[in-house]
């Protein structure tokens, strides 16, 4: 097809475009100190940065969105940087019956793209 | 668990929060006039609007992001409005050997959430 291909080089300069960044957060930051027991400090990988035209387009829809944003910036928003995949996280937390270890699949980003 | 639940009422007023909106686009708008033959006008559903705290959170990661954005707005971006699902679209387009009908699964948004 004649679809435009997503590009991976950032035209805005280093660190400006959509990428994964680690944010340190405590259970207090997250409001979780009443139910999560461990880990007490979390390494939260999040997606940050801008999505210039066709940069890391998630799919055809994102390419269309980028194109239409160029034509109608007031009506169509630019694509934005969101997780493309996640890393499982094991939390030790309270339950009604005691304490449990549970894996959460949608908590920490592993990769990012522009959607 | 003690996770905050995503909320569905928009605190910003009607039409301001993340929702699905239809945008009319021609093949020329999309740069597709040289390879797509039909339809010549597309009804493109896109996700637009803001993502206030916990509005239509996609998952736990989005809830965390909303919380940390409140604490560190310069470092952590707010969640943004992106497709949660897509509607398949059939396009008639040129191929090397003639004309083909093809279904595209990631072209038009069907639902939106804040990620």
């Amino acid at each position: 097809s004649a679809h435009a291909h997503p590009r991976d080089s950032c035209p805005l300069g280093p660190g400006r475009c959509c990428h994964l960044e680690t944010v340190q957060a405590t259970l207090e930051d997250l409001g979780w100190s009443d139910w999560v027991l461990s880990p007490r400090q979390l390494q939260l990988s999040m997606c940050v940065g801008e999505c210039p035209h066709l940069y890391r387009s998630a799919n055809t829809h994102a390419q269309i969105k980028a194109r239409l944003h160029g034509l109608q910036p007031d009506k169509v928003p630019a694509p934005c940087c969101v997780p493309s995949s996640y890393t499982p996280v094991v939390l030790m937390h309270r339950t009604d019956s005691g304490v449990s270890l549970q894996t959460y699949d949608d908590l920490v980003a592993r990769g990012c793209h522009c959607a | 668990s003690a996770h905050a639940h995503p909320r569905d009422s928009c605190p910003l007023g009607p039409g301001r929060c993340c929702h699905l909106e239809t945008v009319q686009a021609t093949l020329e708008d999309l740069g597709w006039s040289d390879w797509v033959l039909s339809p010549r006008q597309l009804q493109l559903s896109m996700c637009v609007g803001e993502c206030p705290h916990l509005y239509r959170s996609a998952n736990t990661h989005a809830q965390i992001k909303a919380r940390l954005h409140g604490l560190q707005p310069d470092k952590v971006p707010a969640p943004c409005c992106v497709p949660s699902s897509y509607t398949p679209v059939v396009l008639m387009h040129r191929t090397d050997s003639g004309v083909s009908l093809q279904t595209y699964d990631d072209l038009v948004a069907r639902g939106c959430h804040c990620a």
Epitope: S33, S38, P39, L42, T87, V89, M92, V99, L101 | -
Partner: antibody, heavy 119, light 112 residues
Framework: QVQLQESGPGLVKPSQTLSLTCTVS??????????WTWIRQHPGKGLEWIGA???????YYNPSLKSRVTISVDTSKNQFSLKLSSVTAADTAVYYC???????????WGQGTLVTVSS | DIVMTQSPLSLPVTPGEPASISCRSS???????????LDWYLQKPGQSPQLLIY???NRASGVPDRFSGSGSGTDFTLKISRVEAEDVGVYYC?????????FGGGTKVEIK
């Protein structure tokens, strides 16, 4: 079922660097909340926490060993490694790798490998 | 670092009888969330340590219910309600409240 296996030389000369690798099987090393840990046990003695690493590469070291320890992770090989520099006879020990939730709950351990520091 | 002290050093036991090991920390292990950050491990002869109890009183997966942990603050106890021959080995307490985690010196449990 997660399994851990230490590997590396059993004999290291004084002043050299001790290098051990722990291979994780039966599960991914790339999980948040998990600290991949090194613990040692001097002959006939108790246990000493050396340090740990998260899948992201963040490291945590025992202050008593910090100046000599480096722990690294290779997610593509599902392995993490320990390097202990400038070893002396006092570093002779059985070295264990283990999986913990942060600094606790070491629920999976390697079988341990004896490293002797001697010329 | 938090210092962990175990007693007794050695504990001869009779199969079928109860046994008790004490562990004391140099500062309170009680977190503001109400949990005591203390683990218990058993190292059987020639084996790696195995987790018995975490957060003071929670039995790890697969651990028989004859093992129980109790205590709060600075004083903790591991109890075996009825000792079996397979329970012999060295028992360690470990504080997990703050880094570095530190272990007690161990209590050797052996059959009389």
């Amino acid at each position: 079922q997660v399994q851990l296996q230490e590997s590396g030389p059993g004999l290291v000369k004084p002043s050299q660097t001790l290098s051990l690798t722990c291979t994780v099987s039966g599960g991914s090393i790339s999980s948040g909340g998990i600290y991949w840990t090194w613990i040692r046990q001097h002959p006939g003695k108790g246990l000493e926490w050396i340090g740990a690493i998260a899948y992201s590469g963040s490291t945590y070291y025992n202050p008593s060993l910090k100046s000599r320890v480096t722990i690294s992770v290779d997610t593509s090989k599902n392995q993490f490694s320990l390097k202990l520099s400038s070893v002396t006879a006092a570093d002779t020990a059985v070295y264990y790798c283990a999986r913990g939730i942060e600094y606790q709950h070491f629920d999976y351990w390697g079988q341990g490998t004896l490293v002797t520091v001697s010329s | 670092d938090i210092v962990m002290t175990q007693s007794p050093l050695s504990l001869p036991v009779t199969p079928g009888e109860p046994a008790s090991i004490s562990c004391r920390s140099s500062q309170s292990l009680l977190h503001s969330n109400g949990y005591n950050y203390l683990d218990w491990y058993l190292q059987k002869p020639g084996q790696s340590p195995q987790l018995l109890i975490y957060l003071g009183s929670n039995r790890a997966s697969g651990v028989p219910d004859r093992f129980s942990g109790s205590g709060s603050g600075t004083d903790f106890t591991l109890k075996i309600s009825r000792v079996e021959a397979e329970d012999v080995g060295v028992y360690y307490c470990m504080q997990t409240l703050e880094a570095p985690p530190t272990f007690g010196g161990g209590t050797k449990v052996e059959i009389k």
